[in-house]
């Protein structure tokens, strides 16, 4: 029986050409976590994080996606393509499947502010 | 073809070290992990550890922590593994064993779909 | 660390026999299970993971089920090139194989 749940960041905002930290983090569950996935709204794999061989960032990403904090993903160097859904998946035993769902939008204006706050979707 | 193909067959004596090399072909290296599994004469499996061609990060068996090292070379598209202070319990014809799955794929690791042909390496004085 | 136990440790079998290996692990492991089929002098080969799913080139005779701590391997109908031994293996960290399973000509 799947208890746990996933807080995220929710919705998010922040400007062309920053960075942002996507976060989710699974709670109300003793389930071990055996890799953590984070996926483009487009289902393009970002990252994985195994608990075992680390971090992996696919090679497209490389230059602009940073690991962490934690389980966590920071997009660098943000374009308005960026735009869009993202997931984070956890896999973990015995519980299964969690994914948790952020949006982010990426804004023209110099006085975008870096939204971010903990929601359960 | 998707292999891996193994060193040849060691004879060491104890306290010696031994290098099995595990050499990729047919695929892209860095996208897949490497396991290696040990198989003594006439006994079942034992899982050694894995290592990651992508980031080097490594994972080994409690029992062997301190004795073995994997490491692979992304130039050669080749894994090592080198187990030290070897004794005559060690003798077991060494695996290395491919993920099914590759790191960009998604999905969970753990299962191996390809393996190498064995290198018998057998401790005795 | 997680412990699996297969039985039988052996069987003997005719062909078109229908066999069941059955492997229990110590605690639950979601579907992180792995079947294998090794010959003697040989690799093993990979049948089924993720508890249920046939790898590719692996005849549909073989399937796979169960979750939690209870997994089952089936083959429908024993062919002469099955006889061999079988290794359940758990992919949850760190990662253990079962005692095996020789099935033997009855």
């Known amino acids: 029986m799947m208890t746990g749940t996933i807080e995220t960041t929710g919705n998010i905002s922040a400007k062309k050409g920053g960075s942002v930290i996507l976060q989710c983090h699974l709670s109300s569950t003793m389930a071990q976590v055996t890799q953590v996935n984070w996926e483009q709204h487009d289902h393009s794999l970002l990252a994985i994080r195994n608990a075992e061989l680390g971090w992996h960032i696919y090679p497209a990403f490389k230059d602009r996606v940073a690991p962490g904090p934690g389980l966590g993903l920071t997009l660098q160097s943000l374009t308005m393509n960026d735009t869009g859904e993202y997931f984070c998946t956890y896999h973990t035993y015995p519980d299964g499947t969690y994914r948790g769902r952020i949006f982010l939008e990426v804004l023209e204006s110099s006085v975008a502010e870096h939204s971010a706050r903990f929601q359960i979707p | 073809q998707v292999q891996l193909v193994q060193s040849g067959a060691e004879v060491k004596k104890p306290g010696a070290s031994v290098k099995v090399s595990c050499k990729a072909s047919g695929y892209t290296f860095t996208s897949y992990p490497i396991g290696w599994v040990r198989q003594a004469p006439g006994q079942g499996l034992e899982w050694m550890g894995w290592i990651s061609s992508y980031n080097g990060n490594t994972n080994y068996a409690q029992k062997l922590q301190g004795r073995v090292t994997m490491t692979t070379d992304t130039s050669t598209s080749t894994a090592y593994m080198e187990l030290r202070s070897l004794r005559s319990d060690d003798t077991a014809v060494y695996y290395c064993?491919?993920?099914?799955?590759?790191?960009?794929?998604?999905?969970?690791?753990?299962?191996?779909?390809?393996w190498g042909q064995g290198t018998m390496v057998t401790v005795s004085s | 660390d997680i412990q699996m136990t297969q039985s039988p440790s052996s069987l003997s079998a005719s062909v078109g026999d229908r066999v069941t290996i059955t492997c229990r692990a110590s605690?639950?492991?979601?579907?992180?299970l792995n079947w294998y089929q090794q010959k003697p002098g040989k690799a093993p080969k990979l049948l089924i993971y993720?508890?249920?799913s046939l790898q590719s080139g692996v005849p549909s005779r073989f399937s796979g089920s169960g979750s939690g701590t209870d997994f089952t391997l089936t083959i429908s109908s024993l062919q002469p090139e099955d006889f061999a031994t079988y290794y359940c293996?758990?992919?949850?960290?760190?990662?253990?194989f079962g005692g095996g399973t020789k099935v033997e000509i009855k």
């Open positions: 605690q639950s492991i979601s579907s992180y």
């Open positions: 993720a508890a249920s």
């Open positions: 064993a491919r993920d099914l799955k590759s790191f960009w794929s998604g999905d969970v690791l753990g299962a191996f779909d390809i």
């Open positions: 293996q758990q992919s949850v960290p760190p990662r253990t």
